[in-house]
């Protein structure tokens, strides 16, 4: 069904990292435009990205209102210059996206090592608590604020002179590891949500090594 020169959107894909959430689709429009609608399971449809020629729509503002909700989205196709025109069933063509649960589905962004500090044979490694676009009481929440103890970090560390990696885990954003005196170490961290079945892990952070800017050394 549908008007002769309007095609339904397809390959609808949610792209979401640390709750920054964009719905993408195909095809690139030829003589047509798109409008996106989003709703919660129990809510009303809200239109976004009105009559756009883009093939993506930023829905972050909607999903951050409640990241534990389930969201539905759909993309409507209209003939360019005649947005009142409808399909043969009396409605414009539309395609549904798969349901989206931000808390479960958003990918974990690449973490950053904020600092490391050596005191004797101990090194304290701190992971930056990245800010998200989720708001509460007029402030932006951090990743830890949103995920709480569902979020853990894994630290990979190794002597600069060798390739044998050790690991440590933490329920906070801090590690305190034992190191050999006089040795330089390199560090990388990964964010993990163990309770998830997909999108459990982030990519590894950039590697930081002792003897470089970020570190601090105290006897």
């Amino acid at each position: 069904s549908g008007t002769t020169n309007t095609v339904a959107a397809y390959n609808l894909t949610w792209k979401s990292t640390n709750f920054k959430t964009i719905l993408e689709w195909e095809p690139k429009p030829v003589n047509q435009v798109y409008t996106v609608q989003i709703s919660t399971k129990s809510g009303d449809w809200k239109s976004k990205c009105f009559y756009t020629t883009d093939t993506e729509c930023d829905l972050t503002d909607e999903i951050v209102k409640d990241v534990k909700q389930t969201y539905l989205a759909r993309v409507f196709s209209y003939p360019a210059g005649n947005v009142e025109s409808t399909g043969s069933a009396g409605e414009p063509l539309f395609t549904n996206a798969r349901k989206f649960l931000p808390y479960r589905d958003t990918k974990l962004g690449q973490p950053t090592i904020q600092s490391f500090e050596q005191v004797g044979t101990k090194v304290n490694v701190t992971v930056e608590d990245e800010r998200t676009l989720v708001r509460r009481n007029n402030t932006f929440l951090s990743l830890r604020d949103v995920f709480g103890k569902d979020l853990i970090y894994t630290l990979y560390y190794w002597k600069s002179s060798s390739s044998g990696k050790k690991t440590a885990k933490t329920n906070t954003n801090e590690f305190l590891i034992d190191v050999d005196k006089g040795e330089n170490y390199c560090f990388s961290v990964q964010a993990v949500i163990p309770s998830r079945t997909v999108n459990r892990k982030s990519t590894d952070s950039p590697v930081e090594c002792m003897g470089q800017e970020k570190g601090e050394f105290r006897e």
Partner: antibody
């Protein structure tokens, strides 16, 4: 030294909502700890109900999730428990507790190291 | 949910004796997430051991924890009169956090 004190009605009628508040003194509720509710049925073991972070992030026991709401009021240094549609099976001593990070094996993990004295709640008509 | 089974249910011992309490998990628990608590009548539980083997602040060294995977043990090397109580193991790695059914250590 942080202390916790539970407060709320000791008697709740069946089908009503049980409401308890835990007041934190001697420290800030926003200081990076989590705050839990646990209950103990008469003569029985302990059951974890749920927890909250100062940001409002919560985790609940799935067996109670449909009836439980835990909230936090940072301005009053309090967190609260609401348990709806109560029955006699919800009669218990209710404890609030603080979850604090302890160092272990290179990282930090949370344990319930400070508890309130507990408050007895009876569900009866 | 992870089920923690404690044994024995009751341990009858005399002061000065050694107490060995067992906690078995229905599935593997990381040592990082295993704790032991002591509870006396009319009181709230008190954290004794965290990370399966580390003593909490102010806990005497007669209390020790060990184990990994699915089998954990709390040992009281020499029972003092104030040690007679109920002991619970707890895992905090998987929601719901769960407690064992408890072991009552009573005076023989």
């Amino acid at each position: 030294q942080v202390q916790l004190q539970e407060s709320g009605p000791g008697l709740v009628k069946p089908s009503q909502t049980l409401s308890l508040t835990c007041t934190v003194s001697g420290g800030s509720i926003s200081s990076g700890q989590y705050w839990s509710w646990i209950r103990q049925h008469p003569g029985k073991g302990l059951e974890w109900i749920g927890e909250i972070y100062y940001s409002g992030s919560t985790r609940y026991n799935p067996s109670l999730k449909s009836r439980v709401t835990i909230s936090v009021d940072t301005s009053k240094n309090q967190f609260s428990l609401k348990l709806s549609s109560v029955t006699a099976a919800d009669t218990a001593v209710y404890y609030c507790a603080r979850d604090t990070p302890y160092y272990y094996d290179g990282g930090y993990y949370y344990y319930m190291d400070v508890w309130g004295k507990g408050t007895t709640v009876t569900v009866s008509s | 949910e992870i089920v923690l089974t404690q044994s024995p249910g009751t341990l009858s011992l005399s002061p000065g004796e050694r107490a060995t309490l067992s906690c078995r998990a229905s599935q593997s628990v990381s040592s990082s997430y295993l704790a032991w608590y002591q509870q006396k009548p009319g009181q709230a539980p008190r954290l004794l051991i965290y990370g399966a083997s580390s003593r909490a602040t102010g806990i005497p060294d007669r209390f020790s924890g060990s184990g990994s995977g699915t089998d954990f043990t709390l040992t009281i090397s020499r029972l003092e009169p104030e040690d007679f109580a109920v002991y619970y193991c707890q895992q905090v790695g998987v929601v719901p956090y769960t407690f064992g059914g408890g072991t009552k250590v009573e005076i023989k």
